[in-house]
């Protein structure tokens, strides 16, 4: 069966029907590049005016305008608010009332696209494997990133959160139109990773999405993550304004000037420092969501009533902090270099500025307790990674899970830890799952490109797709179309239950109280320490901002790591970059 032309609020759209085997039978309808909104520079998105005739939705559209990896050029374009849909089809009748999974990509709110990293037309966020294996509709889309998506003066002149509003527009479009593609508009799951995971969290907290979202999955990121909310947007807006020659004293004049500035100049006016700075790298993530009093009406911790009826899965990778540790403490990955106590203390104090000297000392003390018995470099480096993982991912996720559970009415809560080790050959032997390592498994790469993977990788991928799509279907990761390796029990406040995702998932994979000692430290001991005066949110941007980022590790989820020859705008964008 195939859909043919589909009538949407914008007009007719036609995709392609891809047969899943030479013998016919099952297939997938794929629609690429359906417009869901339009937007002017630094303004809220608006409804797309639509089209006449039948839109041929057969190619991905360019990503939203963003800096290249080297940060010395841009790619993508401003006209970028398009979405992509994968609809699994059986032999006879077209699909009807399928669960819908809407993906929000990560990339530090600075980069990324709905199709993801691309090698030879093999896109990281290709929804086909999830759609066909889980019998769900998958939707991916672009949203504005960087200054164009998140620049804010902290007032009504430039409220910011444009990228979040783009995401909302996409979710609302899906709600209004997905029935025509065979989807159930009352069963929408949003899921995302890193900045996309924090975005998922923020969308569930925003009153704008009331009634739109049934379930949510956050992979390595939460609204409560320290890198997810910008507390001092005006500082960074002024930094950009100075660079592009706009006035900075009056926010109205500044906003008016910024809106008519070349969007490429705005994009290139900001560079994320990738060499070691005075503070940890996440502090330099300038253009991220803000509490605008509207889309995000209050501090996220106060908005959990809005998630009372939204089922939630949230989890992290067991070494999510590794990517950031390698920037903040470069010796972590270098076998011939040593991490010193001073290195670690500097890192700790950079993450505990709000609590001053006492906060830094208390944190340093608890994290270095094991160093007396085991002063090896391996242990010290693991501590650095564990600390970054805790601060940036684990603690915010645990707090969010507890908040979700405490405010739940009909909602169910599930927690996981992804522990399948990274396949990066250059990493230390002790390495676990790095930030973004989970993506290839959720998107079924071990099946799509089998030569690059082992049977154990396929087992991980199969399990994750089964749990994820069952959850989208029923709100329970155990119940749905796909068998699962073991029962995943819901998270409880008493036990802190979580599923440890490894190559062999058994009943022993259900665990409790992840890093309880450290969670208690952050939630109790650290929390009660007095906050020091002074504005710890105001950071000095790096002196030399002309430096370019080195090439990050390439995405090893494909077997042929060759840049595409067909489409320069989709040059390789490693999945391993991206918060």
């Amino acid at each position: 069966a195939k859909l043919g032309a589909v009538y949407t609020e914008g007009g007719f759209v036609e995709g392609v029907n891809k047969k899943l085997s030479l013998l016919g039978g099952d297939s997938v309808d794929i629609f690429k590049g359906i417009p869901f909104a339009t937007a002017k520079t630094l303004e809220n998105p608006q409804r797309h005016p639509g089209w006449q005739g039948t839109l041929k939705a057969t190619n991905f559209k360019k990503r939203c305008l963003q800096a290249t990896i080297t940060q010395d050029n841009t790619y993508g374009q401003e006209d970028c608010l398009y979405l992509n849909i994968w609809v699994p089809q059986g032999r006879k009748q077209v699909s009807h009332n399928l669960p819908v999974m809407v993906w929000i990509y990560g990339g530090a709110f600075l980069m990324g696209s709905g199709q993801g990293a691309n090698f030879l037309k093999n896109y990281l966020y290709d929804g086909e494997e999830i759609a066909t294996r889980g019998n769900v509709i998958v939707v991916t889309f672009n949203y504005r990133v960087g200054p164009l998506g998140f620049l804010s003066t902290g007032d009504a002149n430039l409220p910011g959160n444009f990228g979040l509003r783009d995401q909302h527009m996409a979710i609302a479009w899906v709600k209004r139109n997905i029935a025509a593609f065979g989807g159930d508009p009352d069963n929408i799951t949003i899921f995302g990773e890193s900045a996309g995971a924090a975005s998922v969290s923020l969308q569930t907290l925003s009153p704008y999405n009331k009634g739109l979202i049934r379930r949510a999955i956050s992979q390595s990121g939460m609204a409560l993550s320290p890198w997810a909310i910008q507390k001092n947007p005006l500082f960074w807006a002024k930094t950009i304004a100075k660079k592009v020659g706009c006035p900075t004293e009056d926010t109205g004049k500044m906003a008016a000037c910024l809106k008519i500035t070349d969007p490429r100049a705005l994009t290139l006016a900001y560079k994320l420092p990738v060499k070691k700075q005075e503070y940890p790298v996440v502090h330099y993530l300038a253009f991220i969501p803000v509490i605008d009093g509207d889309f995000i009406p209050d501090d996220p911790i106060n908005l959990y009533n809005n998630t009372a009826d939204i089922d939630y899965i949230a989890g992290i990778n067991n070494m999510d902090g590794h990517l950031f540790a390698t920037i903040d403490v470069p010796a972590v990955d270098k076998t011939k270099q040593t991490v010193t106590e001073e290195d670690f203390y500097r890192l700790v104090s950079g993450h505990t500025v709000a609590k001053g000297l006492k906060g830094a000392q208390a944190t340093f003390d608890i994290y270095t307790e094991s160093w007396a018995q085991d002063p090896s470099q391996e242990n010290m480096k693991k501590t650095v990674v564990a600390f970054e993982t805790d601060v940036l991912f684990l603690i915010p996720t645990e707090i969010a899970l507890a908040q979700h559970k405490a405010h739940a009415k009909s909602a169910k809560t599930y927690s996981y830890l992804f522990s399948h080790p990274s396949r990066m050959p250059i990493y230390p032997k002790w390495m676990g799952a790095d930030h973004a390592d989970d993506l290839q498994y959720v998107f079924g790469k071990p099946f799509a490109t089998p030569l690059g993977y082992r049977p154990q990788d396929r087992a991980v991928s199969k399990a994750m797709i089964a749990y994820w799509t069952n959850f989208a279907r029923s709100g329970d990761p155990n119940m749905g179309n796909s068998p699962v390796p073991t029962h995943w029990y819901p998270y409880t406040l008493e036990n802190g239950n979580y599923l440890d995702i490894t190559k062999t998932i058994t009943s022993a994979s259900m665990k409790e109280h992840l890093r309880e000692k450290f969670l208690k430290f952050w939630a109790v001991t650290f929390e009660v320490l007095p906050t020091v005066t002074g504005d710890q949110d105001t950071l000095t941007p790096p002196e030399d901002d002309s430096e370019v980022a080195p090439d990050p590790p390439s995405d090893d989820s494909q077997v042929v790591p060759v840049p595409p020859t067909d489409d320069s705008v989709e040059a390789q964008m490693p999945a391993t970059i991206g918060f």
Partner: antibody, heavy 119, light 105 residues
Amino acid sequence: QVQLVQSGAEVKKPGASVKVSCKASGYTFTSYNMHWVRQAPGQGLEWIGVINPGDGATSYAQKFQGRVTMTRDTSTSTVYMELSSLRSEDTAVYYCARDYYGSSPLGYWGQGTLVTVSS
Amino acid sequence: DIQMTQSPSSLSASVGDRVTITCRASSSISYMHWYQQKPGKAPKLLIYAASSLQSGVPSRFSGSGSGTDFTLTISSLQPEDFATYYCHQRSSSPTFGQGTKLEIK
């Protein structure tokens, strides 16, 4: 100027089919979607479906799925709406209506065709 | 499908009165359109995209609203305004409100 001229009134028996035509002029026929809307006596407006005259793509309201067929003839700039298995509750005025722009409202309407279903 | 609830279903008013008709969608929609229909005639587009006035329509007609709640306002009723008014949402499955019949008091 845009004009949509519909065929005349019809009286049909239950179980029969009816085919109503709508001839368009004053614009490029293949450039705008054509919708069909009906109105039972003393009742409100009900959307039946839409056709893209350019490629013949159609979409029908769930209620009419399997009973309605919309076609077009580009040589005469005419669209047709055929409704089968008629019942008394199909008695209504049937309108063709053209899109105003993009994903827009229905900006131009035919004069309507009364279809009466009676035994 | 998105359901449209129009209110009131009928309304008596006098020439010169200010009249408001509301339409509520069962879930959030992009834009609302409004039509006027007189007996024996086809509907006529008045307001499109919630608030844009169709050319040739008098400025006493105005529209507002977003999300699920929309309003059609006639600032000062004229004799020719007595008719039935319909709201219309344009999604993948378009629907109309049940209509508001505006009668002379």
